[in-house]
Interface confidence: low
C-alpha cells in the first residue's frame, strides 16, 4: 500500500549521512517506471534539505543530525509520478518524529532566588518556589523531568534540616520549628535541579531565605527608676528620657516603642512621646507644674510596641520621681484685662481707677507698678497703690490713639524677688462722649450758576456721639442771608444752600452757623464760586468771544 507509518528518528544521530530511513513504494511500479519525490518543511521548504528521497528507489534519506529542541516533528508529503510526469498516487503523509536524547542540562531561571518567612512559623509553612527549565522532552521521556533537592543549608542552626523542597514543584517549605530571626536572620540554601527525574545531570542555584521579624520580644526599660527636677510653670519642658532595649528588628513596628503613663498623673500634667531614631520615651510637661500646690509627682510608665506581641509577654514598667522646683513667679494682674468707663476731657489729676496685681508665690512680696505703654501720654500710675490718674486730656475723638471709643494702656507690676519678675496687665478705657465738637459742613467749597441756580446739598458731620449730634440747625450770619438761604433737611443731617438773588460772577464767602442737638455751635465759612451760567455747573466757563 502507498502508506508509511510514522518514522521515529533519534536526535543528534552520528550518521553516516545521508542515512536511509524508509522506502516509499507504489505498487503502480509494476505497470510503469515510477519517480519519487518529497515536499514540505525539511524537504523543499525551510529548513530545506534535511530530508531527501532517492528519485528512483524511493529511499527516504536523512542528510544531517536532527535537533528535537529545534524541530520535534516533520510533516512531509511523498509523491509518485510516471515517466511522463503524471501523478500515479495521491500525495502521502510522511510523519517523522524526532525522539529526544538527554542533551540539555536543567538550568535555573535565576542564579539566586529570594524568599522570606516569619520567624516562629509552624512546620509546613511555604516559603518560596525555585524553578529550573530543561529543554529536553519531559512528556515522553524523563530527559526533561526536573527533580529538585536541597544540597546544603547555611548556617546549620538550630540544625541543618530547617527546610524541605518539593521534588517536582520546587516549593521550599519550613520543616522544623525554631526559626528565630534574633539568632539567624537569613539562611542560604544550595538547591539542585536534576533531570531524568533526579537521576541525570544536575545544576545548582542559591535560595536565600530571609527570616522576617515577629514581635516576640518585649521592650524593657533600662534603667527602670528615674529621678528628675523640673522648674514650676514650665510647659513643654523635657523632664526625662526613658531608655528601652528591644531585640526585635530595629526601626520596625515590633521594635518601635509606645509609652503610656499608667499612674501618678491625675492632673494630666505630663505627656510622653517616642523619639523616632533612638526609640527613647521623652517625658515632657503638658502644662506648668505648681510648686505651691504639689512639689513632687511619682509617675508610672509602661512600654509596649507599635505592633502587638505575637505571644504573651510581660510588659516593663518604669518609675519616675519628678521634683518640682520653686520659681519666683510673676505678679498677675486681676483681671488680666480691665475695662473702665471714663468721661473724655476729665480734669488733670482726676483718678481713673485702681489696677493691682497678685503674686502667686507664698512669701509676701512687695509689688510696684508703672505704666508700660500709654500711646498718648494721658495717664500716670502710683507705684505703690496702682492708682491710675489723668495727666493729659482724654479725647474720644482722637483717631490716632482711640479705636471704637477705647483707649488701650499696658501696665507693669514688678515683685521684689530674686531675681525680680514682672507681669503685665491691659487697661481698656472706654471713653464716654461729651459734646465737645460742633457740626461741620462738607464740602466747604461750592460752584453755582447765577441764573436758574441748582440747590447745593452739604453733608453735616459731628465727631461726637448721639445725643450730641443730629438733628442739626442752620443759620446764615454776617449778612449772608441777603443773597443765600440755608435749610436743614427733614432727617437733619444735610443742609441745602440756595442763591436767592442774582450775583455777578465772582467768589463769595457764605457764613454758615450749624448747631447740634446739644446746642454746640460751629461757624464755618463756605467759599462759593458764582458763575455766569444757567442751571448746573462744575467750573465757570471762560468769557465768550464772538466771531
Amino acid at each position: 500500500d502507498w502508506v508509511v507509518a510514522p518514522i521515529s528518528v533519534p536526535e543528534n544521530g552520528k550518521g553516516p549521512f545521508p542515512q536511509r530511513l524508509n522506502q516509499l513504494k507504489s505498487n503502480k511500479d509494476r505497470d510503469t517506471k515510477i519517480f519519487y519525490s518529497i515536499t514540505g518543511p525539511g524537504a523543499d521548504s525551510p529548513p530545506e534539505g534535511v530530508f531527501a528521497v532517492e528519485k528512483e528507489t524511493g529511499w527516504l534519506l536523512l542528510n544531517k543530525p536532527l535537533d528535537r529542541e529545534e524541530i520535534a516533528k516533520y510533516e512531509l508529503f511523498g509523491h509518485a509520478v510516471s515517466e511522463n510526469g503524471a501523478s500515479v498516487e495521491d500525495p502521502m503523509n510522511i510523519s517523522i518524529i524526532v525522539t529526544d536524547q538527554n542533551d540539555h542540562k536543567p538550568k535555573f531561571t535565576q542564579d539566586t532566588f529570594r524568599g522570606s518567612v516569619l520567624e516562629g512559623v509552624m512546620p509546613g509553612t511555604s516559603v518560596m518556589q525555585v524553578t529550573a527549565t530543561d529543554e529536553d522532552d519531559a512528556v515522553n521521556t524523563y530527559n526533561g523531568v526536573v527533580a529538585y533537592s536541597i544540597h546544603s543549608q547555611e548556617p546549620k542552626e538550630p540544625h541543618d534540616l530547617m527546610f524541605t523542597i518539593h521534588k517536582s514543584t520546587g516549593t521550599i517549605s519550613v520543616i522544623s520549628s525554631g526559626l528565630d530571626r534574633e539568632k539567624v536572620p537569613e539562611y542560604r540554601l544550595t538547591v539542585q535541579a536534576t533531570d531524568m527525574d533526579g537521576e541525570g545531570s544536575t545544576t545548582t542555584a542559591e535560595a536565600v531565605v530571609q527570616i522576617l521579624d515577629a514581635n516576640d520580644n518585649a521592650p524593657e526599660f533600662d534603667p527602670q527608676k528615674y529621678e528628675a527636677h523640673v522648674p514650676e510653670n514650665a510647659v513643654g519642658h523635657e523632664v526625662q528620657r526613658l531608655t528601652v532595649t528591644d531585640l526585635d528588628a530595629p526601626n520596625s513596628p515590633a521594635w518601635r516603642a509606645t509609652y503610656l503613663i499608667m499612674g501618678g498623673d491625675d492632673g494630666d500634667h505630663f505627656t510622653i512621646t517616642t523619639h523616632p531614631e533612638s526609640n527613647q520615651g521623652i517625658l515632657t510637661t503638658r502644662k506648668g507644674l505648681d510648686f505651691e500646690a504639689k512639689n513632687q509627682h511619682t509617675l508610672y510608665v509602661e512600654v509596649t510596641n507599635e505592633a502587638p506581641f505575637v505571644l504573651k509577654l510581660p510588659t516593663s514598667t518604669a518609675t519616675i520621681v519628678v521634683h518640682v522646683e520653686d520659681v519666683n513667679e510673676a505678679p498677675v494682674f486681676v483681671p488680666p484685662s480691665k475695662v473702665v468707663e471714663v468721661q473724655e476731657g476729665i480734669p488733670t489729676g482726676e483718678p481713673v481707677c485702681v489696677y493691682t496685681a497678685e503674686d502667686p508665690d507664698k512669701e509676701n512680696q512687695k509689688i510696684s507698678y508703672r505704666i508700660l505703654r500709654d500711646p498718648a501720654g494721658w495717664l500716670a500710675m502710683d507705684p505703690d497703690s496702682g492708682q491710675v490718674t489723668a495727666v493729659g486730656t482724654l479725647d474720644r475723638e482722637d483717631e490716632q490713639f482711640v479705636r471704637n471709643n477705647i483707649y488701650e494702656v499696658m501696665v507693669l507690676a514688678m515683685d521684689n524677688g530674686s531675681p525680680p519678675t514682672t507681669g503685665t496687665g491691659t487697661l481698656l478705657l472706654t471713653l464716654i462722649d461729651v459734646n465737645d465738637h460742633g457740626p461741620v459742613p462738607e464740602p466747604r467749597q461750592i460752584t453755582i450758576c447765577n441764573q436758574s441756580p441748582v440747590r447745593q446739598v452739604l453733608n453735616i458731620t459731628d465727631k461726637d456721639l448721639s445725643p450730641h449730634t443730629s438733628p442739626f440747625q442752620a443759620q446764615l450770619t454776617d449778612d449772608s442771608d441777603i443773597y443765600w438761604t440755608a435749610e436743614v433737611n427733614e432727617e437733619g443731617d444735610t443742609v441745602v444752600l440756595s442763591l436767592k438773588k442774582f450775583l455777578k460772577q465772582d467768589t463769595y464767602d457764605v457764613h454758615l452757623s450749624l448747631s447740634d442737638h446739644g446746642n454746640k455751635e460751629q461757624l464755618t465759612v463756605i467759599r462759593a464760586t458764582v458763575c455766569d451760567c444757567h442751571g448746573h455747573v462744575e467750573t465757570c466757563p471762560g468769557p465768550w468771544k464772538g466771531g
Epitope: K107, F108, Q110, E135, T203
Partner: antibody, heavy 121, light 107 residues
Framework: VQLVEQSGAELVKPGASVKISCKAS????????MNWVKQRPGKGLEWIGR????????KYNGKFKGKATLTADKSSSTAYMQLSTLTSEDSAVYFC??????????????WGQGTSVTVSS | ELQMTQSPASLSASVGETVTITCRLS??????LAWYRQKEGESPQLLVY???TLAEGVPSRFSGSGSGTQFSLKINSLQPEDFGNYYC?????????FGAGTKLEIK
C-alpha cells in the same frame, strides 16, 4: 535597560597574558550565553567562543583553543576572557555580546563597547 | 569550515536610494543567518536574525530574505545613519562565522 559594559584598553608586552571583563546588567546573566568576538584594525569580525554563566559550559572556535579562556562570575554578573602568550596578531578590539536566547540558533543582540588590546614591546 | 561570501565589498549610494547586499554560503544553513551594521568606532548592532526577523527597534526600511545558501539584506530609502559596515553571520552551526563585510558609503 540591558547593558554590557567592558573593561578599558590594555597595552601588553609580547608573550604576556591579559584578562578582559564584561559586566552585564538588566537581564538574567546566568541564563544567557555570552559570546566573544575579535576585530583586527580595519578588518572583519571573528567569533572566538561562548560561555553559559549558569554552569560555566563553554564552546570555542577551534582557531582560538589554547589562546582564549572564557570564565564567568555569577555573583558580579561579569564574564571574563583571558588571552595568553600574546603576539602582534592578537592586537585587536575584543567585543563581548549576549546571545539572544537559549540554544545555538540565535543571534547576538547586546554588544559591549569593545576593549582594545595592543601588543607591543 | 563553512565559507561565506559577502558582496559587494563596498557600495556607494545616495540618501533616498535602495540598496541590496548579498551573502552566499558554502553549505545549507536553512534560515539561520543574521545581519549586523557597524559604524566607525562603534560596536556591531543586530539588524535581522533568522534570515528575515527584524531586531527590536530596527526601522521597517530594512528587510532580510533568503534561505539555505543564498541570503540578502535590502535597505529602502537610505538615511544618513544607515552608512557604515554591514556583516552577515551564520548562527546555525559552530563556529559562528561572519562575512567579510560590505562598506556602504555616502555618494
Amino acid at each position: 535597560v540591558q547593558l554590557v559594559e567592558q573593561s578599558g584598553a590594555e597595552l601588553v608586552k609580547p608573550g604576556a597574558s591579559v584578562k578582559i571583563s564584561c559586566k552585564a546588567s538588566g537581564y538574567a546573566f546566568s541564563s544567557s550565553w555570552m559570546n566573544w568576538v575579535k576585530q583586527r584594525p580595519g578588518k572583519g569580525l571573528e567569533w572566538i567562543g561562548r560561555i553559559y554563566p549558569g554552569d560555566g559550559e563553554t564552546k570555542y572556535n577551534g582557531k582560538f583553543k589554547g589562546k582564549a579562556t572564557l570564565t564567568a562570575d555569577k555573583s558580579s554578573s561579569t564574564a571574563y576572557m583571558q588571552l595568553s602568550t600574546l603576539t602582534s596578531e592578537d592586537s585587536a578590539v575584543y567585543f563581548c555580546a549576549r546571545q539572544r536566547d537559549y540554544g545555538a540558533l540565535y543571534a547576538m543582540d547586546y554588544w559591549g563597547q569593545g576593549t582594545s588590546v595592543t601588543v607591543s614591546s | 569550515e563553512l565559507q561565506m561570501t559577502q558582496s559587494p565589498a563596498s557600495l556607494s549610494a545616495s540618501v533616498g536610494e535602495t540598496v541590496t547586499i548579498t551573502c552566499r554560503l558554502s553549505e545549507n544553513i536553512y534560515s539561520y543567518l543574521a545581519w549586523y551594521r557597524q559604524k566607525e568606532g562603534e560596536s556591531p548592532q543586530l539588524l535581522v536574525y533568522n534570515s528575515k526577523t527584524l531586531a527590536e527597534g530596527v526601522p521597517s526600511r530594512f528587510s532580510g530574505s533568503g534561505s539555505g545558501t543564498q541570503f540578502s539584506l535590502k535597505i529602502n530609502s537610505l538615511q544618513p545613519e544607515d552608512f557604515g559596515n554591514y556583516y552577515c553571520q551564520n548562527h546555525y552551526g559552530f563556529p559562528f562565522t561572519f562575512g567579510a563585510g560590505t562598506k556602504l558609503e555616502i555618494k
